[in-house]
């Protein structure tokens, strides 16, 4: 019997290079399937499949082609009628728009368009247009749409082609043509600066063309190895240090990329001579010194050695060593009117340069001039004269009384002086003074002048003024400009105190004497001390005033928040009072109150309850402060009861009421007594009470009642009042 045809043969999935087939198994028994499908070329391909197969994928097909498929069941030599189906593969996505977007001298950039996520990879072929030599192949991922093709020859035409690969299938090839650009060249190279051990090289080049520049520095005419340097491609200038002085160099520069180096540019240069010290000059010349100046680059030498030699003399030269930072030097100690040769050596770590030399003649000796007597005293004179600076070793001055032939007085003075005081002369006497200078044993001509001393100095008119309890002022008269000091002695008339002595400047004509006891008689002695003389002593008397009285510091009306301070003082004795309140623990800032000299009490409020205070009161008179009076007080002390009121008064009784103080108290004690006298009666009530009944009184008698608050051992100030029984 005939075999059943496979049932329901159909194409379930189509792709660009595959078709998926499905079918159902026939009822009759069979051994296998035979699957045949046609290729676009007309050929047929056959595949044998196991009997249990119900699907199959045809792979490796071409996109966009129609395929005929026949499926037959076979048993032995028997075949069923074929099941047939026709299907087409999907159209392949297009690869298009191949363009060369950037052209460099050694590479190109390719761009193309293609469907997204379609391709496994692209194959790009690059070939010189006019050459048959092997093309260069590049495989790039299917996700790319552009690629750089480096490593090409400059100024060369290229053919570039591309195809995509999809599951082994190649798309049609796209091609494009492009030529690479001309090789970029270095521009010009110049030596911008030349030194003796370095130079600066500048060059031009296209921006971004080179990764780096390779510079070679070669000594001309030597086989010595060149000095090589590489500098970044962004630079157009570099310093070349460490060269030899006065040497010919050939410098070459190349631009370098990964696989290309430009033709080198060269430049020749001669470095400068080593900078020697130069311009040794003498800028200032005096009779015994000169100033040298010289030039040299900074940092060249550690130090300089200067040699100073008298010309035409064989005696040893004078050597000086100075720091390498100096460019100038003063050479002192030379002879006047003398030719010198000065040489200068530079030095580096002990190595000495060849010398520079200069010749110079010092000036002639200076002269003294203008001797004058500028000040005349009673026992001395002041001389002034002029002379060249730093010229003289010393001066010799001779002083002689004009009308006497006795030996003259000689003085030797340092050469730096231009004035001197001549002491120890007689008052009101004419003198002749002469002077000469000495320079290394040589004496200048003598200069002379005449002058008379003044009369002897005097003091007088010793006055006492501005007497206070502890001080007074002195004033006196004295000859001006003579006295060095005045001595003042203060002695009390009763000789109970030690003598006090003051030495004060001779320029003063007043003195303030303080620190004296009040109400004391003093004798003041004054004498003046001038060079070689003490004047006769003059005297005056003085009595210090009595000290104003400040006494009886009293604290009253103590309550939790304050108290009243009062004191006694002499009338009109004080300008002001200072009251200072300090807590005993010194935890708070002191409070100061300045009161006028007429006040005698101060009410203090706003203090802290339950702490101790120290109160100090001092008086001020003419700026002087008395020693303070002191008292201590505690604000916890009881506040006094207030506002005593009497009511319900009968012949032998009455009710007394009061207002309790702010702070809590334990009890109140009420004392009452007839005003005319007698034994006081007393009653104590609980601290919470504010009234009590007074009984057993005498009719028609005035009673004085006083109430105090009590707490422990403390008692308040009393509050009082009076009433009369009926």
């Amino acid at each position: 019997s005939e075999l059943d045809t496979p049932k329901d043969l159909q194409v379930s999935e189509t792709a660009e290079t595959s078709l998926t087939l499905l079918w159902k198994t026939p009822l009759a028994k069979f051994d296998r399937y035979r699957l045949n499908y046609s290729l676009p070329t007309g050929q047929w391909v056959g595949v044998q499949l196991p009997r249990n197969t119900t699907s199959y994928v045809l792979r490796g097909l071409e996109p966009g082609q129609e395929y005929n498929v026949l499926l037959t069941a076979e048993k032995g030599r028997h075949k069923s009628k074929p099941a047939r189906v026709k299907a087409s593969t999907e159209q392949a996505p297009e690869l298009e728009n191949l363009t060369v977007t950037e052209v460099g001298w050694d590479g190109l950039r390719l761009n193309w368009t293609a469907a997204d996520q379609a391709y496994e990879h692209f194959i790009i072929q690059v070939q010189e247009a006019n050459k048959v030599e092997a093309a260069r192949n590049l495989t790039v991922p299917g996700s790319l749409r552009a690629v750089d093709i480096p490593g090409l020859k400059a100024a060369t035409p290229y053919t570039v082609s591309i195809y995509g690969v999809i599951q082994g299938y190649r798309t049609p090839v796209l091609s494009a043509e492009a030529s690479t650009g001309e090789t970029p060249n270095l521009g010009e190279v110049v030596v911008a600066e030349v030194g003796w051990d370095a130079l600066k090289l500048n060059w031009t080049a296209p921006e971004g063309a080179y990764e780096y520049f390779f510079i070679q520095v070669q000594e001309a005419d030597t086989v010595e190895a060149a000095q090589n340097l590489t500098v970044p491609g962004g630079l157009r200038s570099t310093d070349l240090p460490g060269l030899k002085a006065a040497t010919h160099y050939t410098i070459t520069i190349r631009g370098v990329t990964q696989d290309f180096s430009t033709t080198p540019l060269s430049v020749e240069v001669l470095t400068e001579e080593v900078p020697d010290m130069g311009n040794l000059t003498v800028t200032e010349v005096s009779w015994d010194a000169l100033r040298l100046n010289w030039t040299t680059p900074d940092g060249t030498y550690d130090q300089f050695t200067i040699q100073v030699q008298e010309a035409d003399q064989v005696e040893e030269a004078h050597n000086l060593t100075v720091p390498g930072s100096l460019r100038s030097m003063e050479i002192p100690g030379l002879r006047a009117g003398t030719p010198y040769t000065v040489t200068l050596h530079g030095e580096v770590r002990g190595h000495s340069t060849r010398p520079l030399a200069v010749e110079v003649v010092t000036e002639d000796l200076p002269q003294l001039g203008d001797l004058a007597v500028s000040e005349v005293g009673w026992d001395g004179l002041r001389l002034n004269w002029t002379a060249a600076d730093n010229a003289y070793e010393h001066f010799v001055i001779q002083v002689q009384e004009v009308n006497k032939v006795e030996a003259a007085q000689n003085l030797t003075l340092p050469g730096s002086l231009r004035a001197v005081d001549i002491p120890g002369l007689e008052a009101a006497t004419p003198y002749r003074v002469s002077i000469y200078g000495v320079i290394r044993g040589y004496r200048t001509p003598v200069l002379s002048a005449e002058a008379s001393t003044a009369k002897e100095p005097e003091i007088g008119n010793l006055n006492v003024s501005d007497i206070t309890p502890e001080s007074f002022n002195l004033s006196w008269m004295a000859t001006d400009g003579i006295f060095e000091t005045f001595t003042i002695e203060i002695i009390d008339s009763n000789r109970l105190l030690e003598t006090v002595e003051y030495n004060i400047s001779g320029a003063e004509r007043t003195a303030h004497i303080s620190g004296l006891p009040p109400s004391t008689d003093f004798i003041v002695y004054l004498s003046g001390l001038a060079p070689s003389i003490r004047t006769k002593t003059i005297s005056a008397t003085a009595t210090t005033e009595a000290l104003p009285l400040l006494e009886n510091l009293t604290i009253s009306d103590i309550n939790p928040y304050g108290f009243t301070v009062s004191w006694m003082a002499s009338e009109n004795a004080f300008d002001s009072f200072l009251v200072t309140v300090v807590d005993s623990g010194k935890l708070l800032d002191p409070q100061e109150f300045t009161l006028s000299g007429t006040q005698r009490k101060l009410e203090l409020r706003g203090l802290i309850t339950g702490i101790g205070y120290e109160v100090m009161v001092s008086g001020f008179t003419q700026g002087h402060q008395t020693k303070p009076l002191r008292a201590e007080i505690v604000t916890e002390a009881m506040g006094s009861p207030k506002e005593v009121i009497f009511s319900d008064i009968t012949e032998n009784s009455a009710t007394v009421s009061w207002r309790a103080p702010t702070a809590q108290v334990e009890s109140f004690r009420i004392t009452y007594v007839p005003i005319t006298g007698g034994t006081p009666s007393m009653v104590t009530v609980d601290g919470t009470k504010t009234q009590t009944r007074l009984v057993k009184l005498i009719p028609g008698v005035e009673y004085l009642v006083s109430i105090i608050a009590m707490k422990g051992f403390e008692e308040s100030e009393p509050v009082s009042g009076s009433f009369t029984t009926a």
Partner: antibody
Framework: EVQLLESGGGLVQPGGSLRLSCAAS????????MSWVRQAPGKGLEWVSA????????YYADSVKGRFTISKDNSKNTLYLQMNSLRAEDTAVYYC???????????WGQGTLVTVSS | SSELTQDPAVSVALGQTVRVTCQGD??????ASWYQQKPGQAPVLVIY???NRPSGIPDRFSGSSSGNTASLTITGAQAEDEADYYC??????????FGGGTKLTVLS
């Protein structure tokens, strides 16, 4: 009497480090510049490095620049040469020498041998 | 190569005068210093500056300078003068430079 005594030489592998010391006596160490000079076996003298009296200025030969460091401790009267990244061509006797004003390299130590070899 | 150039070897008959020379650019500006080194010993300064001898150096040693050349002269060479002689100066970068050295042989 001026005395200079080098120490710290020895055998070291290429790329290794060594520190030479030079103990000085008989002069005010802080007032004088000092130098290191080396001499390869059978070869001439080669200046290596110098330092000013205070230690504030240092100088190096191109062949050792960046690898060697000269220093001095004036409180210990000692000169040092720290040698890093040593090469076979650094093999030499290393001398320390004193410099006086106007007198270069006036006193030398007896030297210490440094051998750089694998 | 060294910045100071010396003849590698010089010989002199005992008692005769010999001159050892040293050439280099830095000698136009600086005086050379001269060092004597005997085998196995440290160098010893023999001449510095224009023509100065440290104490203990015999007066048969002298120095001179002209242009870019410095000379060490030994007048009446002695057997103990046989040694290597090195010249030394300062270059433009303030670094010390030594000549390659001259081996002096005294022939008896």
């Amino acid at each position: 009497e001026v005395q200079l005594l080098e120490s710290g030489g020895g055998l070291v592998q290429p790329g290794g480090s060594l520190r030479l010391s030079c103990a000085a006596s008989g002069f005010t160490f802080s007032s004088y510049a000092m130098s290191w000079v080396r001499q390869a076996p059978g070869k001439g003298l080669e200046w290596v490095s110098a330092i000013s009296g205070s230690g504030g200025s240092t100088y190096y030969a191109d062949s050792v620049k960046g690898r060697f460091t000269i220093s001095k401790d004036n409180s210990k009267n000692t000169l040092y040469l720290q040698m890093n990244s040593l090469r076979a061509e650094d093999t030499a006797v290393y001398y320390c020498a004193k410099t006086s004003p106007r007198v270069p390299l006036d006193y030398w130590g007896q030297g210490t041998l440094v051998t750089v070899s694998s | 190569s060294s910045e100071l150039t010396q003849d590698p070897a010089v010989s002199v008959a005992l008692g005769q005068t010999v001159r050892v020379t040293c050439q280099g650019d830095s000698l136009r500006s600086y005086y050379a210093s001269w060092y004597q080194q005997k085998p196995g010993q440290a160098p010893v300064l023999v001449i510095y500056g224009k023509n100065n001898r440290p104490s203990g150096i015999p007066d048969r040693f002298s120095g001179s300078s002209s242009g870019n050349t410095a000379s060490l002269t030994i007048t009446g060479a002695q057997a103990e003068d046989e040694a290597d002689y090195y010249c030394n100066s300062i270059n433009s970068t303030r670094n010390e430079v030594f000549g390659g050295g001259t081996k002096l042989t005294v022939l008896s």
